[in-house]
């Protein structure tokens, strides 16, 4: 589990504490306040600072990753006195056992995998568990299914992301009989990990002297119009030389996704396949299946 | 289309502060990040900080830490941004920008800018 | 934090001629970089996002190249209109940062 907290402040203070699993930092009340102000500052630093609650006296946060270290502060005037008071989250346990090279991804639009290494100081019976949190921290979800390697887990695979928002929070725990185990965490934006199928419904038509291809968008676990969508075409002509550049055509999404370009009859063999990405991050996908079309002799004109 | 509209030039003392209103149309506060740019005279772009006008959280580099508060009124559709203890080098353009995806530590690239409001420091 | 340099400071050149301004980051920024455009009195404008999109309504004599560190803003025929400071920004890691701009002026 994660750590104890350290106050640096007078214990008479303000009392301050932070539940890790709410992300809530809470303090005494002080009577006849007039300011009061929560923030943390990570390693970065950069500076954290979430709405009050309504009380005045605790405060949530919702976008913050501790397993680096963090310091919490509070500040709160009365009309007597003021208070300060920080409170250090170190990430306790033993350094390096932490799992690391934490990675996750989205794929076919409704599955995730999410992989990690065992920290190079942890012990043979250490145990990773995975939890995952939507960045409004509304619901957690235990990983259903862990990939294990030697019995430890070093990966989790979910088939339901209905629980998940824009940006989520991952956090993995560490269990070990013999020492404590640090954990990880990390806050993921689904537009950075969601690996896009390539284009489906690929066809080409070609008529005397132009050839046009179309494609449909593919299915994403991200609500995307049509403008997010850059996608880019290999036109490749058949049988020619080894080292002879391929034709990488760059077309922005469309309501009809489509592509005219001039090819006159006879026509030689070409193939055409087709990748998609996010225009704002550029993650292709892989090529969609090859789709041939034109012939040595010239005759085909539609094809699938 | 959305827009973001600033409020106009203010002239102020050391010490003194300052707040910029930003008012948001084509869309409500709460579907937004607001972020603040600011420009010094004759100088590149610096960003400030993000704010949720949601649940309220801000995100900003340490060094604006105790004399920046990014706040907004979701019943107006309008963000603050308030510098306290201005200094001469606090003055500049300050914009308020957001994006088409964006969370409080950056957007995706800022698609929506509000006109720029000049804050002069000036004894 | 990750530093953005853009070269050359200052661009002089003449319309119809092709321009290159050069963006360099400090360590790898994959493809989430943003160009802007801003002239005199005005905000700037999203150009390019994820190194080389467009953004809608932006002309297509802009276009942007490059992923991890170097990248390139290319306008191939300047437009009169298309005087003006160029910014690249990172959206990479947190903080985002600018870089000091390039400014194109007429030759």
């Known amino acids: 589990e994660k750590s104890d907290l350290r106050t640096v402040a007078p214990a008479s203070s303000l009392n301050v504490r932070f539940d890790s699993r709410t992300m809530n930092l809470s303090w005494d009340c002080q009577e006849n306040t007039t300011f009061s102000k929560c923030f943390l500052t990570d390693k970065k630093n950069r500076v954290v600072e979430p709405r009050l609650s309504n009380n005045e006296c605790s405060c949530t946060f919702r976008e913050i990753c501790l397993h680096e270290g963090v310091t919490f502060e509070v500040h709160v005037n009365t009309s007597q006195r003021g208070f300060q008071q920080k409170l250090l989250y170190p990430n306790s346990g033993r350094e390096g056992t932490a799992a690391q090279n934490f990675s996750c991804f989205i794929y076919n639009a409704d599955l995730m995998n999410c992989t990690w290494a065992r920290g190079p100081t942890a012990p043979r019976d250490v145990q990773y568990f995975l939890y995952i949190r939507n960045s409004k921290r509304r619901r957690e979800i235990r990983c259903p299914y862990y990939i294990q390697d030697s019995g430890t887990h070093v990966g989790c695979h979910l088939d339901n992301l209905s629980g998940l928002t824009s940006r989520n929070y991952f956090l993995v725990n560490g269990t070990s009989r013999e020492i404590g185990i640090q954990f990880f965490d990390s806050l993921l934006d689904t537009k950075k990990i969601e690996r896009f199928n390539p284009p489906s419904n690929v066809t080409v038509r070609c008529n005397t002297t132009h050839c046009l291809v179309r494609w449909k968008q593919p299915r994403t676990y991200q609500k995307l119009s049509y403008l997010d969508f850059q996608y880019q075409l290999d036109v490749h002509r058949k049988n020619t030389q080894p080292g002879t550049e391929n034709l990488l055509i760059n077309v922005s999404g469309d309501l009809e996704n489509r592509y005219n370009f001039p090819s006159s009859e006879p026509r030689a063999k070409h193939s055409v396949k087709i990748r998609a990405a996010d225009v704002r991050i550029l993650n292709w996908s892989s090529w969609s299946e090859a789709i041939e079309f034109g012939s040595d002799d010239g005759h085909h004109h539609h094809h699938h | 289309q959305m827009q973001l509209v600033q409020s106009g030039a203010e002239v102020k003392k050391p010490g003194a502060s300052v707040k910029v209103s930003c008012k948001v149309s084509g869309h409500t506060l709460t579907e937004l990040s607001i972020h603040w740019v600011r420009q010094a005279p004759g100088k590149g772009l610096e960003w400030m900080g993000g704010?949720?006008?949601?649940?309220?959280?801000?995100n900003y580099a340490q060094k604006s830490q105790g004399r920046v508060t990014m706040t907004g009124d979701t019943s107006t559709d309008t963000a603050y941004l308030e510098l306290s203890s201005l200094r001469s080098e606090d003055t500049a353009l300050y914009y308020c920008?957001?994006?088409?995806?964006?969370?409080?530590?950056?957007?995706?690239?800022?698609?929506?800018w509000g006109q720029g409001t000049l804050v002069t420091v000036s004894s | 934090e990750i530093v953005m340099t853009q070269s050359p400071a200052t661009l002089s050149l003449s319309p119809g001629e092709r321009a290159t301004l050069s963006c360099r980051a400090s360590q790898s920024v994959s493809s989430y970089l943003a160009w802007y455009q801003q002239k005199p009195g005005q905000a700037p404008r999203l150009l390019i996002y994820g190194a080389s999109s467009r953004a809608t309504g932006i002309p297509d004599r802009f276009s942007g190249s490059g992923s991890g560190t170097d990248f390139t803003l290319t306008i191939s025929r300047l437009e009169p209109e298309d005087f003006a400071v160029y910014y690249c920004q990172q959206y990479n890691n947190w903080p985002p940062t600018f870089g000091q701009g390039t400014k194109l002026e007429i030759k």
């Open positions: 920008a957001t994006g088409r995806y964006c969370s409080t530590d950056t957007c995706y690239g800022f698609d929506y």
């Open positions: 704010f949720d006008p949601e649940d309220g959280e801000t």
